[in-house]
């Protein structure tokens, strides 16, 4: 089948890194500078991706493969193949229409990207706050208040689950 196809279409013999040049009797010509073909039998070469501005070159373009970009320090990749670069913020901040802004009280972000998220509501799980939250860190929930009452021991069976919205008396 391959031989039949090559007799019918001389372009199928052109390897990656070349293109089938219709202007030269379908001779396989090398891809021009700053272009590539990653598969054989192509009639044109694709233009290499250029990494500009906040994009920097992670892998140079070759005659058979496209360039790959990542983001300059201070930015991180978004999208397939790093199609976008988004500015980092500090922990405890999020990127808004006015740039990096501190998380509002009651929210936190422990990464340089993403949005501020609300602190965990310990009472929903019948627990108490062991360590207060900050802009950079979520609260740490501890044992339920009932577990902390005097005389309670580790062998005490767990308290029955409370309905949501009801706090311990």
């Amino acid at each position: 089948f391959e031989r039949t196809r090559s007799l019918q279409d001389p372009c199928s013999n052109c390897p990656a890194g070349t293109f089938c040049d219709n202007n030269r009797n379908q001779i396989c010509s090398p891809c021009p500078p700053n272009s590539f073909s990653s598969a054989g039998g192509q009639r044109t070469c694709d233009i290499c991706r250029q990494c500009k501005g906040v994009f920097r070159t992670r892998k140079e373009c070759s005659s058979t493969s496209n360039a790959e970009c990542d983001c300059t320090p201070g930015f991180h990749c978004l999208g397939a193949g790093c199609s976008m670069c988004e500015q980092d913020c500090k922990q405890g901040q999020e990127l808004t229409k006015k740039g990096c802004k501190d998380c509002c009280f009651g929210t936190f972000n422990d990464q340089k990207r993403g949005i501020c998220r609300p602190w965990t509501n310990c009472s929903l799980d019948g627990k108490s706050v062991l360590v207060n939250g900050t802009k950079e860190r979520d609260v740490v929930c501890g044992p339920s208040p009932a577990d902390l009452s005097p005389g309670a021991s580790s062998v005490t069976p767990p308290a029955p689950a409370r309905e949501p919205g009801h706090s311990p008396q």
């Epitope: 500009k52 501005g53 906040v54 994009f55 790093c82 199609s83 988004e86 229409k97």
Partner: nanobody, 122 residues
Framework: EVQLVESGGGLVQPGGSLRLSCAVS????????MSWARQAPGKEFEWVSS???????YYVESVKGRFTISRDNAKNTVYLQMSSLRPEDTAVYYC????????????????WGQGTQVTVSS
């Protein structure tokens, strides 16, 4: 061919002013959002300011009230008026298209200028 050419950089004393220009050709400027970014020596790239095609503007907190971004669609030019300059404003300033319309986010298809050096020193 798309071109963005910045000019207007230079050496200025603290408290002084400069006006950067970015002349654009090769695409429809009037419908394009534009932005300025900067990179100080040994520091990371930083988004500075952006302007929608409508003229709506955004600024990073550190330059708000001191820098003004504007555009002249008749001249295919975007400007950055910088006043009350500080030594920490020293950087190479870059003009770029802004296709994402998201502050601090650039797309791989955005175009960038070569940059103009701004030095604030006494």
């Amino acid at each position: 061919e798309v071109q963005l050419v910045e000019s207007g950089g230079g050496l200025v004393q603290p408290g002084g002013s400069l006006r950067l220009s970015c002349a654009v050709s090769g695409f429809t400027f009037s419908s394009s959002a534009m932005s300025w970014a900067r990179q100080a020596p040994g520091k990371e790239f930083e988004w500075v300011s952006s302007i929608y095609s409508s003229g709506k503007t955004y600024y990073v907190e550190s330059v708000k009230g001191r820098f003004t971004i504007s555009r002249d669609n008749a001249k295919n030019t975007v400007y950055l008026q910088m006043s009350s300059l500080r030594p920490e404003d020293t950087a190479v300033y870059y003009c770029a298209t802004w296709k994402t319309l998201r502050v601090g986010v650039w797309d791989e298809s955005d175009y960038w200028g070569q940059g103009t050096q701004v030095t604030v020193s006494s």
